[in-house]
């Protein structure tokens, strides 16, 4: 007796596809161990076609796939497009070498079958409209046309030109003639379902010179296209359910029992199990649409489908795509955080996972909005102007080779409690799904700044110093300023760094920059934060207005996010004459060109703002004495 | 309403044959697998064989104890289930009972894993 398990007999037709699934015993060495499928020859030899350490046959070559699903203690072998060759014994099994535990699964693959001569077979899918087409002799052309269903040895009309029609037929069965055509008619029937599968026998006339035609109608529901995706990765399910229902609501639902339960539709309902991680997308004139669905879990395997009506609602008689999605928990995708928590006034520093073989592909951040089918605006990325209403206080830190980029949010207001995506113009199943939380603030914020009211004189020597407690101790102090392609790390001086580590003065610990003397171009926003490495903490911002000399009035600063630094001893710190330079960048036209979901932040030109000299941002690390 | 009615249980002599039918109505969908289970008196159901179908495959799964005596057959748009015993032995004597489920969704051993059961017809192999 084996321990691996399987369907012993598997029968199809030829240009079918299988999916033949094995079960093995619950063991690390199992799941662990090499998978394969052979077949069995008359030798006894048992020839690989296809193994889990990525060994693929000729004769298998582009229509074979094996998958270990580990947690499951299982593995899938897919085969498409079946011939008759195909016929004959195989083993599924666990080992180095197929003598290994193993299966015997016999594999049958017939002819698709034959009908008599004077039988048509029309073959639809549920939902569609066959069209049957019934010819006779001219002797019958002022006769009675009529179809009927074949129930055992009677006939049941379905539909006849005395304008008669099968109450079940109602609105679905037309029979008609086609221009000056006098030996033929046709009967269509839309909407088809699987009862109305069966034999139909049309008839001009009465009696034996009646003119009879047999047609055998075949009501397929569509077979489930297998998805093997693993787990926190995405998944798109592409519709095309044709040009007659282009104007028809779409939906997904996901099958359960009996029912099937609409996931998304374009009607505005959505599923909250999916709320933030999914979306809807139109993709032409013709019906065709896609959805979307980020951050997979265990729980999202199961059957899917796709279909058209007028509620938005799964109904009987209209077409169907399906699909059977299933999740694979050995995930090359890293756990990361899916809820992220900040508080009013604070930030939050969140790090997205990336493909690290694709370092050098462009890095994105996007809002999850849940109006009409879903979208996610594009508000930072490594080529991407920041979004309006986010300047100053997004930046994204791109870490290249770490496998990782750190988005960060400061001056939250409660406003941005919502999800976010992150993602990259490479590999598109490394997106993932972030919550973000922001709860009133109860206490001040860690980092504070002074002066309050920032305004700087050209010419001058200005310093802003920034407050940070003893936690922080530790953890590396910086300054940067801030410009659409990010916040540029600037040299500063940290104070509290010179005291012994075992006395620790909250009052005393400062990080300060000076900007010496002060340019026009100095103006603009300044992050104070923390970091440890390539994890950044905590950021606080302040607007830095610049002045001439000559002018008396104040500068108004352009948001109260300054007003949060609360009075504090200013201090010496190291002088930097810092500048930054203009040149232009254009976001990358091609990004989702075939993912429309996810919103360009513009395809205009932007200004990112870079280094140009040594005491700048470009490259260089903060320096902290 | 999804209905399992099982037939053609009895008494039969060690050695002899007999066939099984299941017919199912309701059950939804056109993918779906349909199973024999046996519960022996105070025992547990056991799993016997099964049959799934998507779209125009099948696949049969057979218990180890019944392999190369017993045959799992059926027809997915009429809804039953065949199983033709044969040699059967008084080991075989339980409540045969018919399974069903709208999908081939994991492993067709487990009785967990099928949504819909029949009542149950008795079979009785003695001399």
């Known amino acids: 007796q084996s321990p691996i398990f399987g369907p012993q007999d598997v029968s199809s037709i030829e240009g079918n596809s299988v999916s033949i699934t094995c079960y093995y015993p619950d063991t690390s060495v199992n799941r662990h161990t090499r998978k394969y499928w052979c077949r069995q020859g008359a030798n006894g030899y048992c020839a690989t076609l296809i193994s889990s350490n990525g060994y693929l046959s000729k004769e298998y070559s582009g229509r074979a796939s094996l998958i270990n699903f580990p947690e499951n203690s299982t593995f899938v072998i897919n085969i498409a497009h079946l011939t008759q060759e195909d016929t004959g014994s195989y083993k599924c099994g666990l080992g180095t070498t197929n003598r290994g535990l193993f299966f015997d699964v016999s594999l049958e693959v017939s002819q698709v079958p034959e009908f008599p001569n004077d039988t048509h077979v029309y073959t639809k899918d549920i939902g569609r409209t066959v069209t049957i087409e019934c010819r006779f002799k001219e002797g019958n052309a002022h006769s009675k046309k009529s179809l009927c269903k074949k129930r055992g040895e009677a006939c049941e009309v379905v539909i006849d030109s005395t304008e008669y029609v099968d109450p079940s037929y109602k609105d679905r069965a037309i029979l008609f003639m086609k221009g000056t055509s006098r030996d033929i008619f046709y009967v269509n029937i839309s909407h088809l379902i699987p009862s109305d599968a069966g034999l139909y026998v049309c008839q001009a006339g009465e009696g034996p010179s009646a003119d009879k035609n047999n047609a055998d109608l075949q009501v397929l529901e569509p077979e489930p296209e297998l998805l093997y995706k693993d787990l926190r990765s995405s998944v798109t399910f592409e519709c095309d359910l044709g040009r007659e229902v282009a104007n028809d609501a779409k939906y997904l639902c996901r099958k359960n029992k009996e029912t099937c339960d609409v996931i998304i539709n374009t009607l505005g309902k959505r599923d909250p199990a999916f709320e933030g991680r999914i979306l809807l997308t139109p993709r032409d004139d013709n019906g065709r649409f896609s959805v979307l669905i980020t951050g997979l879990r265990k729980e999202d395997a199961g059957h899917y489908q796709c279909g058209a009506h007028s509620s938005g609602l799964p109904q009987e008689g209209w077409p169907v795509q399906a699909w059977q999605l299933f999740v694979n928990e050995e995930s090359t995708i890293p756990n990361s955080r899916s809820v992220v928590k900040g508080v009013t006034g604070g930030s939050v520093a969140i790090v997205c996972p990336y493909n690290p073989k694709e370092s050098s592909s462009l890095k994105y951040w996007c809002h999850w909005e849940a109006d009409e089918n879903g979208r996610c605006p594009v508000l930072v990325g490594t080529q991407a102007l920041v979004q309006e209403g986010y300047e100053g206080r997004l930046a994204l830190f791109d870490q290249p080779g770490s496998g990782a980029y750190t988005v960060i949010l400061n001056q939250l207001t409660t406003q941005d409690s919502g999800f976010y995506w992150c993602l990259t113009d490479g590999d598109s199943r490394w997106r993932t799904t972030i919550e973000l939380q922001v709860a009133e603030a109860t206490k001040k914020p860690d980092l504070e700044v002074t002066p309050q009211n920032a305004t700087a004189v050209i010419g001058e020597t200005f310093t802003i110093s920034c407050h940070y407690p003893c936690k922080f101790y530790s953890q590396e102090k910086y300054w940067c300023k801030w410009s659409n392609d990010g916040c540029h790390i600037l040299p500063s001086h940290d104070e509290g760094a010179r005291q012994s580590s075992v006395s620790c003065d909250q009052s005393s610990q400062i990080v300060s920059m000076t900007l010496n003397p002060v340019k026009k171009e100095d103006e603009g926003w300044y992050w104070c934060g923390v970091k440890e490495g390539q994890v950044y903490g905590e950021t606080t911002a302040i607007y830095v207005a610049v002045e001439e000399r000559t002018r008396g009035s104040p500068h108004i600063n352009p948001t109260d996010a300054n007003a949060r630094a609360k009075d504090a001893p200013e201090e010496e710190a190291m002088e930097s004459s810092v500048r930054e330079d203009e040149n232009k960048a254009n976001l990358d036209p091609r990004l989702f060109a075939d993912e429309r979901e996810i919103q360009n932040a513009g395809d205009q030109a932007q200004e990112n703002r870079a280094s140009g000299n040594a005491g700048s941002a470009g490259g260089q690390s903060g320096s902290s004495k | 309403e999804v209905q399992l009615v099982e037939s053609g249980g009895g008494l039969v002599q060690p050695g002899g044959s007999l066939r099984l039918s299941c017919v199912a109505s309701?059950?939804?969908?056109?993918?779906?697998?349909m199973a024999w289970f046996a519960q022996a008196p105070g025992k547990e159901r056991e799993f016997v064989a099964a049959i799934a179908w998507r779209g125009r495959t099948s696949y049969k799964y057979y218990s180890d104890s019944v392999k190369g005596r017993f045959t799992v057959s059926g027809d997915n748009a009429k809804r039953t289930l065949d199983l033709q015993m044969k040699d059967l032995n008084p080991e075989d004597t339980a409540l045969y009972f018919c399974?069903?489920?709208?999908?081939?969704?994991?492993?067709?051993?487990?009785?967990?894993?099928?949504?819909?059961w029949g009542q149950g017809t008795q079979v009785t192999v003695s001399s």
């Open positions: 399974a069903a489920h709208p999908n081939d969704d994991g492993d067709p051993r487990i009785s967990g894993n099928y949504q819909y």
């Open positions: 309701g059950l939804p969908g056109s993918s779906s697998r």
